[in-house]
Interface confidence: low
């Protein structure tokens, strides 16, 4: 008996060939002997099978002695032995229809689990192997699970179902819903406008949900909700915003927030959460703000940074075009009785300058000028 594997939702063509290369009478039946389709001369007739208008044939092939049964939009329950009766002969074809589906949805939040479930006809014992877009192989039986989905798991998963030494390949497009970056850091001088951007790592036609930015200022004892907003078909509308700081939010994607100015009291870290409609869980992106301030008070020139800096960052004070006067892995450095001239405060990481603030020191009888 010939075995043919089919995919749920696909079209399959079961072949039936007569020895005579001409149009003769044929019938396709299922294992219950219910007629599916056949011919009366050049006219195709259909029986009352469950295949309804999903069954078809190719009349153009009848003259060549070929009488295929085409089944469209395959269902698991179409798995059966199909019998072609032609020239007093019976050709039997066993059709096994498999379906591979992702749990609930193919759009999953980062960190969630992906479960692929194989639908198979009774009596079959298939094996499944799937390959992720980043080349990871997983094997299993009726279900395959991948926990803690990462952004790199977005893309086409290729799964091969093996049964009776025949195979059928499924391709499932998985979209991992996440922000492009898990974390970002913004370095600003005091008084500068701050732009926060939260680009998404996926595109969908309609995006609806709600979000909030919680902020933990370094100087504050507890976190505070800075802004809450709604997202409707990619349009952003602010629901509530704090008065201090008064954030501005862009009306379109990517999510974009503007802090009017960087101040030491705002330095800290925030967590933007986005709850998408019909999804359990939330998307998260951490954002950090580091603020620098350079000041001269009497005979003391001070440079300070606030916010989440790594211990390997170097803070330096130097007179323009000269060697650094002071350089420390600290959040504040100072120089007593600085020489007159343009001083630079630099925050650097392995020689790369992240933030720079200039302050002009005047001769001792004058007051300092900040450009």
């Amino acid at each position: 008996k010939k075995v043919v594997l089919g995919k749920k939702g696909d079209t399959v063509e079961l072949t039936c060939t007569a020895s005579q290369k001409k149009s003769i009478q044929f019938h396709w039946k299922n294992s219950n002997q219910i007629k599916i389709l056949g011919n009366q001369g050049s006219f195709l007739t259909k029986g009352p099978s469950k295949l309804n208008d999903r069954a078809d044939s190719r009349r153009s092939l009848w003259d060549q002695g070929n009488f295929p049964l085409i089944i469209k939009n395959l269902k698991i329950e179409d798995s059966d032995t199909y019998i072609c009766e032609v020239e007093d002969q019976k050709e039997e074809v066993q059709l096994l229809v498999f379906g591979l589906t992702a749990n609930s949805d193919t759009h999953l939040l980062q960190g969630q689990s992906l479960t692929l479930t194989l639908e198979s006809p009774p009596g079959s014992s298939p094996s499944v192997q799937c390959r992720s877009p980043r080349g990871k192989n997983i094997q299993g039986g009726k279900t395959l699970s991948v926990s803690q989905l990462e952004l790199q798991d977005s893309g086409t998963w290729t799964c091969t179902v093996l049964q009776n030494q025949k195979k059928v390949e499924f391709k499932i497009d998985i979209v991992v819903l996440a922000f492009q970056k898990a974390s970002s850091i913004v370095y600003k001088k005091e008084g500068e406008q701050v732009e926060f951007s939260f680009p998404l790592a996926f595109t969908v036609e309609k995006l609806t949900g709600s979000g909030e930015l919680w902020w933990q200022a370094e100087r504050a004892s507890s976190s505070k909700s800075w802004i809450t907003f709604d997202l409707k078909n990619k349009e952003v509308s602010v629901k509530r915003v704090t008065q201090d700081p008064k954030l501005q939010m862009g009306k379109k994607l990517p999510l974009h927030l503007t802090l009017p100015q960087a101040l030491p009291q705002y330095a800290g870290s925030g967590n933007l959460t986005l709850a998408l409609e019909a999804k359990t869980g939330k998307l998260h992106q951490e954002v950090n703000l580091v603020v620098m301030r350079a000041t001269q008070l009497q005979k003391n020139l001070t440079c300070e940074v606030w916010g989440p800096t790594s211990p390997k960052l170097m803070l330096s004070l130097k007179l323009e075009n000269k060697e650094a006067k002071v350089s420390k892995r600290e959040k504040a450095v100072w120089v007593l009785n600085p020489e007159a001239g343009m001083w630079q405060c630099l925050l650097s990481d392995s020689g790369q300058v992240l933030l720079e603030s200039n302050i002009k020191v005047l001769p001792t009888w004058s007051t300092p000028v900040q450009p």
Partner: antibody, heavy 118, light 111 residues
Framework: QVQLVQSGPELKKPGASVKVSCKAS????????IHWVKQATGQGLEWIGE????????YSNAKFKDRVTMTADKSSNTAYMELSSLTSDDTAVYFC???????????WGQGTLVTVSS | DIVLTQSPASLAVSPGQRATITCKAG??????????MNWYQQKPGQPPKLLIY???NLESGIPSRFSGSGSGTDFTLTINPVEENDTATYYC?????????FGPGTKVEIK
């Protein structure tokens, strides 16, 4: 949304042929069968036949078998029904229809009036 | 071919009352637990509108005043309560086998 838009009214002489079109939109044209239904003035509904736009396979009611030709153009998402050797009995409104999720015709064209008169 | 007969041919009902239309098939239209009978409403100058499919399933967007029942060869369409805008011709249709066939129709008038 699913839409079936048919061609305008036709006036034909006995013995001539008529070709009615049905332009589909709002779904994948090749995924669904297009059916044709006749309704003579003040009369009931009569199934003419069906076409599979993907393969071009067409099946018709034996009553119309020798006179009807159903075709489909995938590039324009349009199905056609041509009726030849027209007589006054063919004066009717011709509808194209598509099944929904069930077995009934959930979507219909607006109908095309064909008048056969000398 | 499966022949469908409908009764009554016409019916006059007062608003708020129940209207019942029956359809008899020349042979059973049942298969594997399903009855392949559909019901349509048609108003003058309009294409038919699907009300009920597979004997008793209400098509999306159709008010629950419309209901279908029956199996084998005998089927019923019930409108309860009838409203003014239910004036139309109602057709049954079998989708069990080719050629697909419609009943002759029942004209419903609201008194």
């Amino acid at each position: 949304q699913v839409q079936l838009v048919q061609s305008g009214p036709e006036l034909k002489k006995p013995g001539a042929s008529v070709k009615v079109s049905c332009k589909a939109s709002g779904y994948t044209f090749t995924d669904y069968v297009i059916h044709w239904v006749k309704q003579a003035t003040g009369q009931g509904l009569e199934w003419i036949g069906e076409i599979y736009p993907g393969s071009g396979s067409a099946y018709s009611n034996a009553k119309f078998k020798d006179r009807v030709t159903m075709t489909a153009d995938k590039s324009s998402n349009t199905a056609y029904m041509e009726l030849s050797s027209l007589t006054s009995d063919d004066t009717a409104v011709y509808f194209c229809a598509r099944r929904g999720n069930g077995t009934g015709f959930a979507y219909w064209g607006q109908g095309t009036l064909v008048t056969v008169s000398s | 071919d499966i022949v469908l007969t409908q009764s009554p041919a016409s019916l006059a009902v007062s608003p708020g009352q129940r209207a019942t239309i029956t359809c008899k098939a020349g042979q059973s239209v049942d298969y594997d637990g399903d009855s392949y009978m559909n019901w349509y409403q048609q108003k003058p100058g309009q294409p038919p509108k699907l009300l009920i499919y597979v004997a008793s399933n209400l098509e999306s967007g159709i008010p629950s005043r419309f209901s279908g029942s029956g199996s084998g060869t005998d089927f019923t369409l019930t409108i309860n309560p009838v409203e003014e805008n239910d004036t139309a011709t109602y057709y049954c249709q079998q989708s069990y086998k080719d050629p697909l066939a419609f009943g002759p129709g029942t004209k419903v008038e609201i008194k």
